[in-house]
């Protein structure tokens, strides 16, 4: 009987040691979790504040809906304009609607006045079709008025509230467009 009691006591002591070990592990785990939580919260706060501080468009760009626009301060031919936009992570302006056209022409009136600005529209040499740089055709209301009788390459530009066409090798200002950053706040 004494042996039986002694065995039970030993078993209980072993159990107690295991529980103490488990408690120690749990405390350690809890401390680790708290540290991780702290790190996660700090990371989240940093991310949120940087997202809050970063504007949807870069400096000197104008926002309208989900687009950012940059109006150049230099003249260049159409190809150089396209390259300049690409290097900024954008492309020459692609006008999707009358609303966008109105916004652009309204903004230009406020910023610069009545100058010529290249957009991302060019005429296919073979078919004579007008195409945006992504290969899509402009909507019927946004086809350039035929102003260019040039035998050379013909590209589209905006002046006042009109879309016009000209030899791609003439010098004009240009407008770049890219997606605005989505604010996650």
């Amino acid at each position: 009987k004494l042996l039986q009691v002694s065995t039970i006591a030993m078993q209980q002591q072993e159990k107690l040691i295991q529980q103490e070990r488990a408690l120690l592990n749990f405390t350690e785990w809890k401390r680790s979790c708290a540290l991780q939580m702290k790190y996660c919260q700090a990371f989240m706060q940093n991310s949120l504040s940087s997202a809050h501080n970063s504007s949807p468009c870069p400096n000197n760009w104008i926002q309208n809906r989900e687009s950012c626009y940059y109006v150049s301060e230099i003249w260049s031919i159409w190809h150089t304009s396209q390259e300049n936009c690409l290097k900024e992570g954008s492309t020459l302006l692609q006008i999707e609607s009358k609303e966008e056209m109105d916004f652009i022409t309204g903004s230009l009136r406020k910023i610069k006045g009545s100058y010529d600005y290249w957009v991302g529209l060019s005429q296919d040499g073979h078919s004579g079709r007008w195409l945006w740089q992504d290969g899509s055709s402009p909507s019927p209301g946004l086809l350039p008025a035929e102003r260019s009788q040039s035998a050379n390459q013909v590209c589209g530009y905006v002046k006042s509230n009109s879309l016009l066409s000209s030899n791609c090798s003439t010098w004009k200002y240009f407008i770049c467009e890219k997606y605005a950053l989505r604010s996650s706040v």
Partner: nanobody, 115 residues
Framework: QVQLVESGGGLVQPGGSLRLSCAAS????????MGWYRQAPGKERELVAR???????NYADSVEGRFTISRDKDENTVYLEMNTLKPEDTAVYYC?????????WGQGTQVTVSS
Amino acid sequence: QVQLVESGGGLVQPGGSLRLSCAASGSISSINVMGWYRQAPGKERELVARITNLGLPNYADSVEGRFTISRDKDENTVYLEMNTLKPEDTAVYYCYLVGLKAEYWGQGTQVTVSS
């Protein structure tokens, strides 16, 4: 990463022809401009010709009417057909590509026009 590999350079007599090729591989944005610059010894690098993803070309005045740029959009390859070559066309010809936030250059191919 984008890689540009040029080929087709060589020695040719004045009045002769050459066809340069430049193959682009890697992740290329759908809207881009590809083209050719050249650099003669002791001179600055100058634009020769370029072409958009939709095939709209543009030429330097010195080569207009003699050189023709074209591209195979599916193969991401740009070609420069050079006719009526002159000694002043002698240079290293570099292929380049401008994509979104990126500009890439090939290693260059030597073109020598001499009798």
